[in-house]
Structures are given as C-alpha cells and as structure tokens.
C-alpha cells in the first residue's frame, strides 16, 4: 500500500509534470508564437484510456514528436531548450509510471493536434493529482 | 459573415515592387492570422507566408525570405503584403486567407485557412 | 525540398466515387488539408485535419490518411464537384508549407 510520502512524491511529481504541459500549451497557444499555423499540422497519437499512472506509457511514446514540434517554436516561448524540457518530463514520467511492469500503450483511432494532446493530459494530471488530495 | 476583400489588380515592370492589401470583416481581427498564397497562370497554388493579425509577427515562406514583407493596420483591419524586385515568373493571382486557429482560447473553429479574399491578379510585365 | 504528389486528373461518372490521393514522406506524423477550387473562383477548404468537414460541406466529401498517402473522397460525385483539388501540409520538421500540385476532378 502507499505510503503518504510515497502519495506526497507522487503528487509533487504529478504537479511538476502539469507545470511543465501547461508551460508548453502556453508558449504554443501564444500571440508571441508565429509558428502555431505550422505547429497545428502534426498529429500525435492519443491514449484510449487514461485513468492511471501506467498509462503514461502513451505519453512517454509521443515525447519524441512532441520534442521536434517544440524545436519549431521560437526558445523565448519557453524556459529551458525543447530538449532539456522534454529531457525532465521524461524523467517524471518514467518515476510515475514505474519501469518494473510493461504496459503496452493502445491508441484512440483519431489523431490529435499538439493543443488537444496537450489539454488531453494535463487533464489526466489534473485527475490524478485531485484522487491524491 | 467573415470577408476579405482585397485590392484591384495591379501591373508592374520588372524590378519594381507591389503592394496587395486585404481587408477583415466579420469577425474579431486580431485573434486569427492571415496567410498570403498565390498561384501563377494555369499552375497549382504556392504559401507565402503568414502574419498576426494581434502583434504583427511574420513567418515567410524560405523561397520568399528578403523579398516579402507582411504588415498589417488594425485600425481598418487590413493587412498587406509587399513583395519587391518583382520578376516576370511573379505573375499570378495573389490571395489572403485566414487561418482558423482563434489565438488564446485555445481552440478553432476549424485549422487552415478557412475563408479566402477573392484574389488580386499581379502581371509582371515589361 | 518536401513534396506532395496527387494525380493530375481523375474521371468519375455522376454518382459514382471519386477518389484523390496525396502522398508524402511526411504524412503518417503530418495531418492534410484538401482544398477545392472552381474555374476562376477562391479555393474552399473540404477537408482539415485528414478527415474533418467544415460547416457548410456536403457530407459526400470525407478524407482519410494512412502512412504517407491522404485521400480525399467524393461519395456520389456530382457535376458542380467538378474542380481542382488541392491538398495540403507540412514537411517532417514542419518548416516548410507545401500544396500538391493539384488534381482535375472531371464528373462527365
């Protein structure tokens, strides 16, 4: 059973991560960002079901994508270069959901521009995080 | 009803520049952009580039780099594009068109460029 | 420099479904946008984001996109579908917009 640091670790985690997504949706979703119209033309897949931390499984698969639509936007949208931000969300990520058990990520048929995909899991953190407290 | 009305055709001699303006109505100017594409006679359609219509910001096609420029007036909700040292290969019917992201909601009604002015033919000619 | 490729022309009767094809590299990470373009006239955008519809559309046109190759789909095609269409996207780092070259939908 968890333990309430194990919760609290989980949860500042949770909250580092919902940082870093809403970081990024503001930096896209910008007057400033004169590359948006571009930015809109990726597609990145999306979880049919999130409801759990291994299921961050889907999100760690899409990092790559989310990285090389980053590299577009101008670095003064955001605080850190795209790779060292996708480096730490990384990071999060592979602690939330763990690496001791294998969890194949199924996708939703439709794809999903960088604005859904993000408001898609910052909502999933949102989630989380609200069943911790 | 969203429009955009742009400017009369224009012919220009080698080496000169032309300036097409497009007019915004119908909805609220500065929270979308407005792409420029254009299409020589008889041949497919070619992007130029983009402007804010909020803040001005630009992103210009690579061939069209130094030699466009797109600006924009708020207070008639018009935008322009200027495109200079103008060569025969330049003639072609000009368009604006809006992009359907709505900046800061953080959604749209549909991306791409969802509504066209009806295009402004530019002769290059000498 | 990036390229989308989409037949020249396509001949359907009335009726019967028209489909245009769009490949590129690019297209199993980028979505395609289909435009439609009568003699003369503004294109009219029928197709964003592989398979949505704008308002305003007739529900015979739908898109669809599997690895690199987009299409867009006429069911029951009629004689004012006859037009230029055009599709659209991104190159794989996104720096570069590019419109096929267009195809001729002919409904005899």
């Known amino acids: 059973a968890p333990t309430s640091s194990s919760t609290k670790k989980t949860q500042l985690q949770l909250e580092h991560l919902l940082l870093d997504l809403q970081m990024i949706l503001n930096g896209i979703n910008n007057y400033k960002n004169p590359k948006l119209t571009r930015m809109l033309t990726f597609k990145f897949y999306m979880p049919k079901k999130a409801t759990e931390l291994k299921h961050l499984q889907c999100l760690e698969e899409e990092l790559k994508p989310l990285e090389e639509v980053l590299n577009l936007a101008q670095s003064k949208n955001f605080h850190l270069r795209p790779r060292d931000l996708i480096s730490n969300i990384n990071v999060i990520v592979l602690e939330l959901k763990g690496s001791e058990t294998t969890f194949m990520c199924e996708y939703a048929d439709e794809t999903a521009t960088i604005v859904e995909f993000l408001n898609r899991w910052i909502t999933f953190c949102q989630s989380i995080i609200s069943t911790l407290t | 009803e969203v429009q955009l009305v742009q400017s009369g055709a224009e012919v220009k001699k080698p080496g000169a520049s032309v300036k097409v303006s497009c007019k915004a109505s119908g909805y609220s100017f500065t929270t979308y952009g407005i792409s420029w594409v254009r299409q020589a006679p008889g041949q497919g359609l070619e992007w130029m580039g983009w402007i804010s219509a909020h803040n001005g910001n630009t992103d210009y096609a690579q061939k069209f780099q130094g030699r466009v420029t797109m600006t924009k007036d708020t207070s008639t909700s018009t935008v322009y594009m200027e495109l200079r040292s103008l060569r025969s290969d330049d003639t072609a019917v000009y368009y604006c068109?809006?992009?359907?992201?709505?900046?800061?909601?953080?959604?749209?009604?549909?991306?791409?460029?969802?509504?066209w002015g009806q295009g402004t033919l530019v002769t290059v000619s000498s | 420099s990036y390229e989308l490729t989409q037949p020249p022309s396509v001949s359907v009767s009335p009726g019967q479904t028209a489909r245009i094809t769009c490949s590129g590299d690019a297209l199993p990470r980028k979505f395609a946008y289909w435009y439609q373009q009568k003699s003369g006239q503004a294109p009219v955008m029928v197709i964003y984001?592989?398979?949505k519809r704008p308002p305003g559309i007739p529900e015979r046109f739908s898109g669809s996109s599997s690895g690199t190759m987009a299409t867009l789909t006429i069911t029951g095609a009629q004689v004012e579908d006859e037009a230029d269409y055009y599709c659209y996207s991104t190159d794989s780092g996104g720096d570069v917009s590019v419109f096929g070259g267009g195809t001729k939908l002919t409904v005899l």
């Open positions: 068109a809006r992009d359907g992201y709505h900046y800061g909601s953080g959604s749209y009604d549909n991306a791409g460029f969802d509504h």
């Open positions: 984001e592989d398979s």
